[in-house]
Structure formats: C-alpha cells, structure tokens
Interface confidence: low
C-alpha cells in the first residue's frame, strides 16, 4: 500500500504524459487522478514507466474500479496487463474481439501465462461458444491453443469454426481431442471436391474411423507417412494391404522405415505375410501363409 500524501504544489497531473516518468511513486499516487488515468489509458503504453510506477497506476485503477475495470479501460491497458493477476481478470467482462487482440498482442512471443489463460476463458465463456473469429485470433497468437482445450470444451466448437484451424494448430492434440474435432472437420469440409477435401481434412485424420480411411483409399490421395503414423491404431488395423497401398500411394515405401513403430507394427501383425510380400518392401511379421485367421473381433478378445 502506497502511503497517502498530499500532492506537492504545481505537480498535479493535467495530462498523462512523459513528465510523469520523473515522478516518485508517492507523487504518482498523490498527483495523478484515477479518473484522468482511466480516460487516457491509451497514452500509458507510449511512456516508459518503470515496473514500480506501473504498480502505482494499477493500484489507482483498482481503487477506482473495485468491481473490475470497464472494457474501455481494459482495451488500452497495454503493458499494464502484465501486472494483472488472474483474480483481477476474473472480475472483467470482455466482449470485444479487438480488446482480446490488444491484450494478446502485449503477451505475444511468450508462453500462455495464467493471466492470458484466464482472459481467454472469460472471453470464450462470455461468447458462449468458440466462434470462427475468436478461434482464428487465438490460434494465430497461440498455435497450440486448440490442443490445450479438453474434449468437453472442444465439443462447443461449431463446425464453421474449423475453417480457421491451420495444420500447425493441431500439432499437440492427442487422439481424444482429434476424436472430437474430426467429425466437425468432416462436416465443415463436406462440400469440397476430393483433392481439396483431403488437403483440408488431413490434419484431423488422427480422429478418423476405419470406414473413412477406406473411403479415402479409393480417392488417390497419396497420404504421407507422417499423417499415417498419427492415425488411430484401432482405425488402421482393419485396413487390408491393398487399401493401405492405395491410401499411401507412392509413400507406401515408407512403411519399411516405420515397421517397428505403431500403428504400422500392429497393422503388420494382422496381415497375411503373402499379402505383405506383394508390396515388395520386405515387411516381416505377418500371419504365416496357411494359418487360419480368426474373426478379428474374436482375435481382439483372445489377445
């Protein structure tokens, strides 16, 4: 708490300007009117205040707005945002995407802080759903944002928002998250033609079921090995050798390098060796020729 002292004669601030950087902390407290500060917040960013001076300015705003800052002040917080605690931010009601962008800009280049996480949470909850414009903004600043959400939170993402998602936004998503996102992507891109559709859906395929992979194998998509390796093992296992060959196209030769890794390893174990031999890649570990293959659902139960 800064001690209350009278403002020295002639030092009362009429404007928020560079002269204030020469004020001591107690002079800022005594001589800067909180209401003036609130109306001229946009000037604070252009003035090289010390962190200690910013603490005083924050304290003045806290006193003026004990229930939380209005959006007109929040939008112009600039570097003062870095001084806010999650508790401060929980009092805010941020509805404008421009305000959100302005604050994310301040934190740009840094990991998502608890303050930013709280701000985003408040904003999204206020909007009721993660709409396309919001998602576009958040993933631009934090490519990993989408994958930081729980499957439950992702379920509120409307399919129309999927158009804002870039492949790198999904890099850290786990299979449970892709299980939620894939059906939304499928719906969002359903009216695109074959090659365009595959370009868009490719990043989401870690959530695709077997029947969709079978359908893709009929469309000459030439899936790369990196994408194939991210597919759900349970979705890959029922695919035949011919289907995988069609799905991968010229990339099928990459199976050899991945034969010890899932899902390729598990898939090999489910194929007849003579079928694998038709690929000419020297893949080993398939079901020996002449062996009886049990019904696959039965095989699952026995394993």
């Amino acid at each position: 708490e800064v001690e209350k002292t009278a403002c020295p004669s002639g030092k009362k601030a009429r404007e928020i300007d560079e002269s204030l950087i020469f004020y001591k902390k107690w002079e800022l407290e005594a001589c800067v009117d909180a209401a003036l500060l609130a109306t001229q917040m946009d000037r604070v960013n252009a003035i090289p205040f010390t962190y200690e001076q910013l603490d005083v300015l924050k304290h003045k705003l806290d006193e003026l707005y004990p229930q939380g800052y209005p959006e007109s002040v929040i939008q112009h917080l600039g570097y003062l945002f870095l001084k806010m605690s999650p508790e401060d931010i929980r009092k805010w009601n941020v509805t404008s995407l421009e305000t959100l962008k302005a604050l994310l800009e301040v934190n740009k280049g840094h990991e998502m802080s608890p303050q930013v996480a709280t701000l985003i949470d408040r904003f999204v909850k206020g909007r009721g759903q993660l709409d396309k414009d919001t998602l576009d903004t958040l993933t631009a600043f934090y490519p990993g944002y989408l994958c930081s959400l729980s499957p439950e939170e992702l379920s509120s993402v409307p399919p129309s928002s999927i158009w804002a998602v870039r492949p790198q936004d999904l890099d850290t998503c786990d299979p449970r998250q892709l299980d939620v996102l894939y059906p939304k992507a499928r719906l969002a891109f359903q009216n695109m033609n074959g090659s365009e559709y595959f370009v868009k859906i490719q990043s989401f395929l870690g959530g695709a079921p077997t029947e969709d992979l079978k359908a893709l194998s009929q469309q000459n998509v030439s899936m790369d090995l990196a994408t194939f390796m991210k597919l759900r093992t349970d979705a890959v296992l029922p695919l035949t050798v011919a289907e995988v060959q069609k799905l991968l196209g010229p990339h099928v030769e990459g199976l050899k390098a991945e034969e010890r890794h899932r899902p390729v390893r598990d898939w090999i174990l489910r194929q007849r060796q003579d079928d694998l031999d038709t690929l000419g890649l020297g893949l080993q570990g398939g079901i020996p020729n002449g062996y009886l293959v049990l019904d696959l659902s039965m095989q699952e139960a026995l394993s």
């Epitope: 740009k108 631009a140 490519p143 033609n193 090659s195 365009e196 370009v199 490719q202």
Partner: antibody
Framework: QLQLQESGPGLVKPSETLSLTCTVS??????????WGWIRQPPGKGLEWIGS???????FYSPSLKSRLNISVDTSKKQFSLKLSSVTAADTAVYYC????????????WGQGTLVTVSS | EIVMTQSPATLSVSPGERATLSCRAS??????LAWYLQKPGQAPRLLIY???TRATGIPARFSGSGSGTEFTLTISSLQSEDFAVYYC???????????FGQGTKLEIK
C-alpha cells in the same frame, strides 16, 4: 510502406553454408496474418520456392532442400534468416525474401533479391 | 511434386494486341494458382491469385481463368510496360510445396 531487404555475402565457397537475412521494415514481422518466405532464381532460369517461416518460428521447407535448410525468425530484430549448408555451384542464384498470407500460398510482396555465387 | 508447364516459352505480340499465356498443372490445383510478372533485374510482382482475382494495383487489362489443371492469363491490350517474363505458381499442396512454371517470355513483335 512495407520493405523487405535481403543481406549476406555475395560469394560462398563450395561445401560451406550460405547465410542470408531479410529485414522487414514498414510493417510487423510479428503479424499473425503472414508467413515469411525465401524463393531463389538461378541465372537465366525460373523460380524455386525454398521455404517459409511464421513469426512463432514454425517453418516449412522445400522437400528437395530440407536436409540442408534452416529458416528462423528473430522478431525483436524484425528479421528472418536462411541457412543452406553444403552448397554447390547449383545453389548459385538470386535469392529473394517475400511475404505470403498465412491462409494462402502466394507471395504478395518481394524483396529486390540478392545474388549469391557459389565458387572457390 | 506438382509440375507446372507454361506455353509458349516465348510469345511475340505487337503493342495494343491481345496476349494469351497458358499454364498446365500435372494434377489438379483447384483454383489455387497465381501469376507473376518479372522484368529484367527486378523481383517478381504478383498479378493474379486464386486463378482470376487481380492483386492490388493491377490494371483491368490483366485477367485470369481456368480451374483444375488448365489455366490462362490474358492481357487484352498490350502496353509497352507489359513486355516481361510471366510465371504461374500453384499453392494447392499441403504440406506446402509450392511450384512455379518455367516462365513465358512476352516480347515485342
């Protein structure tokens, strides 16, 4: 007015590393709307895309150059850089830096280019 | 990779006349195709993107058409400043693997 300016040595010896920097002025390199790319053009020949980088540092490389290539960004200096290792005479070209919108793969703004010759 | 083939390699046309340049993709690139103009000693300049949308500041005499694998750039009435090399570029692939055509040189007849 956006300007892109390539800089770096004009002569590199075979087997060494070619290093170029592009400085962005009159605009923000940290814009979430753009990637920053490199394209090259051997003397008298056509254009070849090398790679692109986002302000977060994520990059995409041409498959044919990937094993020798590194593209990075330094937002504080408003620069992005290209490093191509183990160069040969075939890497002699005019190297351009350019901007591309992140939702599209076209190049809407280019630097004036810098000629790099690989020779002993 | 997708190979882009431009034709003809050189096109001789008189000022004021119409010029038609072709670009063919080895597989469909949808409408994700751009055209660039390059004058000697200068960097390329974006003319057209999305097959038919003119870039900012590009005159209406430039127009693009096509889809899939066949594309055309038309210059309706050639001006002296239009004589240059023209390149097409596809940007349909993911991961990005952008490829350019080998260029068409448009020269004064």
């Amino acid at each position: 007015q956006l300007q892109l300016q390539e800089s770096g040595p004009g002569l590199v010896k075979p087997s060494e590393t070619l290093s170029l920097t592009c400085t962005v002025s009159g605009g923000s390199i940290s814009s979430s709307s753009y990637y920053w790319g490199w394209i090259r053009q051997p003397p008298g020949k056509g254009l070849e895309w090398i790679g692109s980088v986002y302000y977060s540092g994520s990059a995409f490389y041409s498959p044919s150059l990937k094993s020798r290539l590194n593209i990075s960004v330094d937002t504080s200096k408003k620069q992005f850089s290209l490093k191509l290792s183990s160069v040969t005479a075939a890497d002699t070209a005019v190297y351009y830096c350019a901007r591309r919108p992140y939702k599209s793969g076209l190049f809407d703004f280019w630097g004036q280019g810098t000629l790099v010759t690989v020779s002993s | 990779e997708i190979v882009m083939t431009q034709s003809p390699a050189t096109l001789s046309v008189s000022p004021g006349e119409r010029a038609t340049l072709s670009c063919r993709a080895s597989q469909s690139v949808s409408s994700n195709l751009a055209w660039y103009l390059q004058k000697p000693g200068q960097a390329p300049r974006l003319l057209i993107y999305g097959t038919s949308t003119r870039a900012t500041g590009i005159p209406a005499r430039f127009s693009g058409s096509g889809s899939g694998t066949e594309f055309t750039l038309t210059i309706s009435s050639l001006q002296s400043e239009d004589f240059a090399v023209y390149y097409c570029q596809q940007y349909n692939t993911w991961p990005p693997e952008y490829t350019f055509g080998q260029g068409t040189k448009l020269e004064i007849k």
